[in-house]
Amino acid sequence: SERCDDWGLDTMRQIQVFEDEPARIKCPLFEHFLKFNYSTAHSAGLTLIWYWTRQDRDLEEPINFRLPENRISKEKDVLWFRPTLLNDTGNYTCMLRNTTYCSKVAFPLEVVQKDSCFNSPMKLPVHKLYIEYGIQRITCPNVDGYFPSSVKPTITWYMGCYKIQNFNNVIPEGMNLSFLIALISNNGNYTCVVTYPENGRTFHLTRTLTVKVVGSPKNAVPPVIHSPNDHVVYEKEPGEELLIPCTVYFSFLMDSRNEVWWTIDGKKPDDITIDVTINESISHSRTEDETRTQILSIKKVTSEDLKRSYVCHARSAKGEVAKAAKVKQKVPAPRYTVELACGFGAT
């Protein structure tokens, strides 16, 4: 066979679909690899060919488009399953070609099983809701293109195993689920089941997402440095270990990069010659506010080190703050034999 531009196995597109449900899978060539769309390719006389390799097999085989009730079909650049079966799992390839041109890409398709509470190995999208922020909605995802706009599906919403009927603060409204005031107790997995008719058959689409209630932007503040502070003095003798924690609280902010760093005499620790180590730990509250702690450590501190300026800095989308640690050299307790004796005029 003549040469074909092979984009390999596109593992970035790990497609997961539920067993016994319809699935429509677009050929990734037009979305990620080529600079033209299917219509342009088709107009130019290019043909889209599909084939697959079953799970745990090496043999590429054509897809059987002659199954009863057209269970698998192709429409433009979409491969349709009506519905999927567990053994449809495998690597699927779409190839665009004519006599002079060829390009192909493979992608993995995994058909997964769900339990009665919609648990499955499927990776779930996470939707963040702001706590006590007013009405917020989640929308049943990835159902476009399954049925025409003339078809009115029925949509049922569940939290875990249980159907959501109008409840104090969670209200199903067709494709949307409205949270009047989101609370921590609303955290969990929410599932919409979309049921629609097609050619005398009834199909179900199941879509689950995780709702995570997070801190509201109304309550967000610039970073707060809890340590170092004015109440703690790091008093050390030369040769001792100096440990200074920088503990910073960050309000949850969507897509904000939280940063903490130390400067020593105005320079980053990497840019100076002292043997200093920095260890960082991060913890989160239930609403994803973040506390970062960076511990600056100098194993054997020198009297020079104890004269330096140690400043903790923090930055988020809400602002930047800094706080200097109070570091000083401990005055050694007098040794009687020398200092006190001298004080008493002994020679």
């Epitope: 567990l86 099983q113 339990d115 009665s116 509470c117 919609f118 648990n119 939290m159 875990g160 195993c161 249980y162 159907k163 959501i164 009927q165 409840f167 969670v170 107790s185 969990g188 997995n189």
Partner: antibody
Framework: QVQLVQSGAEVKKPGSSVKVSCKAS????????ISWVRQAPGQGLEWMGG????????NYAQKFQGRVTITADESTSTAYMELSSLRSEDTAVYYC????????????WGQGTLVTVSS | EIVLTQSPATLSLSPGERATLSCRAS??????LAWYQQKPGQAPRLLIY???NRATGIPARFSGSGSGTDFTLTISSLEPEDFAVYYC?????????FGQGTKVEIK
């Protein structure tokens, strides 16, 4: 620690109803669901249905549909199971058990309530 | 509804021996299966969920395996307190169903 405490034993006449309660403590009631499972003398376990503590919606086994009603009172952290039109074969120990809203396994169980149906 | 068949009905073993209990489903339940232990006069206790995950506080001698229709609960070395009835339960489809139980008794 989590505890589910059920109401005491009941003796009922055929055709009557029984309502068993299950009070939860040591956890956030609204974060969980409560299922009811029964066990006839010397027999295995039979799942009857369950309820979401937060939404108050229930799932029932087809076998009990129309005869069992499961409710939950979030204010008292208590779930109830009412079984009507009792017959002698309903004589069993009735257990309540807790599970996460999206879990199919029952992680904490009540001590059980013996319901005897006899004329 | 899905029928779970446990075997054997009774298993007679001595302390220290290995116990292997089987649970077969009438159709695939993937890995949506749990195991429980029940002692006389007590409520069941969750041992294993998701076919192979040990519940909190369950000793390492208990292990679960299997997927689809065939599942196994193994007790690597029986302790005196392990003699009880064991039930499997599926949650793949409504209604949730239990096996009829396997009694592990002292030989």
């Amino acid at each position: 620690q989590v505890q589910l405490v059920q109401s005491g034993a009941e003796v009922k006449k055929p055709g009557s109803s029984v309502k068993v309660s299950c009070k939860a403590s040591g956890g956030t009631f609204s974060s969980y669901a409560i299922s009811w499972v029964r066990q006839a003398p010397g027999q295995g376990l039979e799942w009857m249905g369950g309820i979401s503590a937060i939404f108050g919606t229930a799932n029932y086994a087809q076998k009990f549909q129309g005869r069992v009603t499961i409710t939950a009172d979030e204010s008292t952290s208590t779930a109830y199971m009412e079984l009507s039109s009792l017959r002698s074969e309903d004589t069993a120990v009735y257990y309540c058990a807790r599970h996460l809203h999206n879990a199919i396994h029952l992680d904490y169980w009540g001590q059980g309530t013996l319901v005897t149906v006899s004329s | 509804e899905i029928v779970l068949t446990q075997s054997p009905a009774t298993l007679s073993l001595s302390p220290g021996e290995r116990a292997t209990l089987s649970c077969r489903a009438s159709q695939s339940v993937s890995n949506f299966l749990a195991w429980y232990q029940q002692k006389p006069g007590q409520a069941p206790r969750l041992l294993i969920y998701g076919a192979s995950n040990r519940a909190t506080g369950i000793p390492a001698r208990f292990s679960g395996s299997g997927s689809g229709t065939d599942f196994t609960l193994t007790i690597s070395s029986l302790e005196p307190e392990d003699f009880a009835v064991y039930y499997c339960q599926q949650g793949k489809h409504w209604p949730w169903t239990f096996g009829q139980g396997t009694k592990v008794e002292i030989k």
